[in-house]
């Protein structure tokens, strides 16, 4: 099952700890299970102590849909997925979903083990998942040139991957991993662009198609695919709707948003 | 509105170098990535080398070591200088930049390609 989302009127602070929690989220494989019982995620009313992250954010995100989140550095998005994650917690309004969470950091990271290991990530195998994943990330090129093919080890003594490489098995990891609500955290920025193209439609918006995803991205191309748009804008929600709708805001929306 | 306008092309010998630039021009308010992709005939595109807004590069195994991919931020400019250049890197190479325009707020960014350069290497 995927999972549905909900926040209300949610407001969220960074305290001290920040350097902590976002070390922490970036490890994190978020396993952890929320017991709504109603396959939903809620987010509502959502704010942290000291200068809020976020401010009053709403959203409603059903099951399979793709929320595009948008917005200036320094706007909230990353602190929306911690919220979801419950790796910061709101001072104010209510967040709901159900189930498990799958999370690609902005930061790709690999461990030492063999890419296979690296994707799998103690998760059980499953050869036809695994393959599905290897080819809509882009990486069966990359393994055909190993002669140990996806056993080729990783990381410490290993061999030395490109940033584009360390991307797409980091967002490998995270795709593969059966979960309910899939927070893909600019996941494309190490890509090239044909390659980004290709790895969004044939891994977000086809493999992914029936999966709860919230897509942190600033392109105009992502935003026309997804059935959702927030944007964000120093904590706060400038705009939440469809892409229709976003443009039906022209003028007004360029001459309100720049700076 | 916006426009990227390559240069630097031209017919090389086999072991010849070249550098290609790509500029920017129009109403942009900031650049994320800028590479250079090339196209023989007959063949789809590839990406051939590309930069973030950070530095970060990545690189085509078929010209790692011989070509370098850099950017000048402040002139919305990217280059590509390539060394010990083989016939198999005859091809028009095209330059791709992803820009937010200024009219677009919260940095909301679209693809440009340019119209492409042609590079010739004879043996």
């Known amino acids: 099952t995927t999972t549905e989302v909900v926040m209300e009127n949610v407001t969220a602070f960074w305290e001290e700890g920040f350097g902590e929690l976002f070390e922490k989220a970036k490890q994190n494989n978020n396993n952890r299970k929320t017991s709504n019982g109603d396959d939903s995620l809620f987010f509502s009313n959502f704010s942290l102590l000291g200068t809020p992250v976020l401010k009053d954010i709403n959203f409603k995100i059903e099951r399979g849909q793709l929320l595009a989140v948008a917005g200036s550095t320094g706007a909230g998005k990353t602190s929306l997925l911690m919220v979801i994650m419950g790796e910061l917690e709101p001072s104010e309004g209510k967040i709901k979903h159900s189930g498990r969470i799958s999370f690609c950091s902005q930061f790709s990271w690999i461990m030492p083990g063999t890419i296979k290991e690296n994707i799998i990530f103690g998760v059980s195998y499953d050869e036809y998942r695994y393959r599905s994943v290897i080819k809509a990330c882009q990486l069966e090129e990359d393994i055909s040139k190993f002669a140990e093919k996806d056993n080729i080890v990783l990381g410490e003594g290993g061999i030395t991957l490109s940033g584009g490489q360390r991307a797409r098995i980091s967002l490998a990891r995270a795709v593969y991993k059966d979960a309910d609500l899939y927070l893909l955290d600019s996941p494309f920025g190490y890509l090239d662009v044909l390659t980004e193209k290709e790895i969004f439609e044939s891994c977000v918006c086809k493999l992914m198609a029936n999966k709860t995803r919230i897509l942190v991205t600033s392109k105009m191309e992502h935003l026309k695919k997804a059935d959702k748009i927030l944007i964000l804008h120093e904590g706060s929600s400038y705009f939440y709707g469809t892409f229709s709708e976003l443009q039906n805001l022209q003028p007004d929306f360029s001459s309100k948003l720049m700076g | 509105q916006v426009q990227l306008q390559e240069s630097g092309g031209g017919l090389v010998q086999a072991g010849g170098s070249l550098r290609l630039a790509c500029a920017a021009t129009?109403?942009?308010?900031?650049?994320?990535?800028m590479g250079w992709y090339r196209q023989a005939p007959g063949k789809q595109r590839d990406m051939v080398a590309f930069?973030?807004?950070?530095?970060?590069?990545d690189y085509a195994d078929s010209v790692k070591g011989r070509f370098t991919i850099s950017r000048d931020n402040a002139r919305n400019t990217v280059y590509l200088r390539m060394n010990s250049l083989k016939p198999e890197d005859t091809a028009t190479y095209y330059c791709?930049?992803?820009?937010?325009?200024?009219?677009?707020?919260?940095?909301?960014?679209?693809?440009?390609w340019g119209q492409g350069t042609q590079v010739t290497v004879s043996s």
């Open positions: 791709h930049a992803e820009i937010a325009e200024r009219s677009r707020p919260f940095y909301l960014t679209d693809d440009y």
């Open positions: 930069i973030t807004r950070a530095g970060n590069t």
């Open positions: 129009g109403s942009i308010r900031n650049i994320n990535t």
